[in-house]
Interface confidence: low
């Protein structure tokens, strides 16, 4: 006598709410004599899903005719799936006994999980900008997916990141799940044009993962480098002071010229030169008439970038001894 095998080919069945689910079960032998029943779960608390002989199961239909003499297909179809239907379904063979049927063999079970796609990942960056060499955190969130198994990866400019932590909630059984992941990214001076991407792969996406992105330009502040130079003009009694503000981001920058501590001009950066890496350069000029000067002049350029503390760069404009002599003559 061939030993009976209960074949449930699908380990996992993914079904969307409202769909029908077909739970397959075939047997390899007609013996021993007795019915095949369907249960959800195992142990004493298991729930009867279908019993051909008795009970009322309005949402369950059989795939084949169970009254046929040599029927070996005990597959069932459950209509209008709801979240409450999730669980593991077992087809179980019972042996005719007295006074009750005795469980003989169970199939390996088919887990029915609700199939729901994750929402498009939303990536959010830090609340405040940070400067290069500092670490910033980006958070990626996606929700509404089922089953619970999901893969999340982070990329920076296409290169996979490894410093991140991911949570899937809840831990217990649920209609749907959400994922939250936080990646830590060390900023580099050239990251103005960089992008971080969160990629979510799920069984419902058929190998086409969802992506969410964020620009590092929203998270980075590259402080300017400052250079001040002076050039005498042809006229001889004028000096052109050039103040170069280089490689800064974002654009908002204010420059104030001070002569011996007194404000003589305030400018807001407008005509900027953009560098290849996305940072900006700006040049400001100040023409100083030295013929009017009788003493050395301290010229200070004050740069305020993106609401940060002002940075000063000073230059002493030395008046020639001849001009100083003229000055002392004039006071006699």
């Amino acid at each position: 006598e061939e030993e009976l095998q209960m074949i449930q080919p699908e380990k996992l069945l993914l079904v969307a709410v409202g769909e029908s689910a077909t739970l397959n079960c075939t047997v390899t032998s007609l013996l021993p004599v007795g019915p095949v029943l369907w249960f959800r779960g195992v142990g004493p608390g298991r729930e009867l899903i279908y019993n051909q002989k008795e009970g009322h199961f309005p949402r369950v239909t059989t795939v084949s005719d169970l009254t046929k003499r040599n029927n070996m297909d005990f597959s069932i179809r459950i209509s209008s799936i709801t979240p409450a239907d999730a669980g593991t379904y077992y087809c179980v063979k019972f042996r005719k006994g007295s006074p009750e049927n005795v469980e003989f063999k169970s199939g390996p079970g088919t887990e029915m999980a609700l199939r729901a796609k994750p929402s498009a990942p939303v990536v959010s960056g830090p609340a405040a900008r940070a400067t290069p060499e500092h670490t910033v955190s980006f958070t990626c969130k996606s929700h509404g997916f089922s089953p619970r198994d999901i893969t999340l990866k982070w990329f920076k400019n296409g290169n996979e990141l490894s410093d991140f932590q991911t949570n899937v909630d809840p831990a217990g059984q649920s209609v749907s799940y959400s994922i939250r992941s936080t990646a830590r990214v060390v900023l580099a001076p050239w990251d103005v044009r960089s992008q971080v991407t969160c990629e979510v792969a799920h069984v419902t996406l058929q190998g086409d993962p969802l992506r969410g992105t964020a620009n590092l330009s929203e998270a980075i502040r590259v402080p300017p480098t400052l250079e001040v130079t002076q050039q005498p003009m042809r006229a001889g009694n004028q000096v052109n002071i050039t103040y170069q503000v280089r490689n800064f981001y974002p654009q908002n920058l204010q420059l104030t010229w001070l002569e011996n501590g007194n404000v003589c001009r305030t400018e807001t950066a407008s005509t900027l030169t953009e560098n290849k890496d996305g940072t900006y350069n700006w040049t400001s000029w100040l023409l100083v008439n030295t013929s009017d000067q009788r003493d050395d002049v301290v010229l200070t350029c004050q740069v305020k970038h993106d609401g940060q503390l002002a940075v000063n760069k000073s230059l002493v404009l030395e008046v020639s001894a001849h001009q100083k002599d003229q000055s002392s003559d004039a006071t006699h």
Partner: antibody, heavy 127, light 107 residues
Framework: QVQLVQSGAEVKKPGASVKVSCKAS????????MYWVRQAPGQGLEWMGW????????GYAQKFQGRVTMTRDTSTSTVYMELSSLRSEDTAVYYC????????????????????WGQGTMVTVSS | DIQMTQSPSSLSASVGDRVTITCRAS??????LAWYQQKPGKAPKLLIY???SLQSGVPSRFSGSGSGTDFTLTISSLQPEDFATYYC?????????FGQGTKLEIK
Amino acid sequence: QVQLVQSGAEVKKPGASVKVSCKASGYTFTSYYMYWVRQAPGQGLEWMGWINPNSGNTGYAQKFQGRVTMTRDTSTSTVYMELSSLRSEDTAVYYCAKDRRRGVGLAAAGTSAFDIWGQGTMVTVSS
Amino acid sequence: DIQMTQSPSSLSASVGDRVTITCRASQSISNWLAWYQQKPGKAPKLLIYAASSLQSGVPSRFSGSGSGTDFTLTISSLQPEDFATYYCQQSYSTPYTFGQGTKLEIK
């Protein structure tokens, strides 16, 4: 046999942190969710959160979010619960508990319940 | 969060009595409910899981029933060692929540 052994009683000052350990033995540590539950003197049971010992993923009750950190060390089959910014109302017995159902993540089938509990760790917060 | 409400909060009974404790969930939790027994100074002990499944090693005088929002723990014939505090707990969705407890005392 399956058991969870917790670290000893602690006395802490308000504002300090406490880290309680729970060492598992007698079963496959990474195959079952672990939970933390606390009980203030004369009060009921309060669920704090869970940890998946396989992945290290965690979930915390909103009340403890930002103050609690659950971690695990698979090499020693130990889970840890650290509670920071302690206040007097955190005085309680802290229990770790194992899930009855085998499997974590998608493999966790069936209803959850806590079948094995640690002996409890008394944490007293007093100035 | 799902609220779990137990009643009564305390009750007195005698050895041999049949005792029933009820637990109500603020929303449907299917059969994701467990019952625990706790004695003073001890950790809780699992009695029933999945609303009606008896945990291994627990005497058969304990039984659970119910589904959805209303659940019952029944002790068919009280024994001296059954005087303790009983808690229900849902594990349908996080945060898992407990009932406030029912203290069973000797009459």
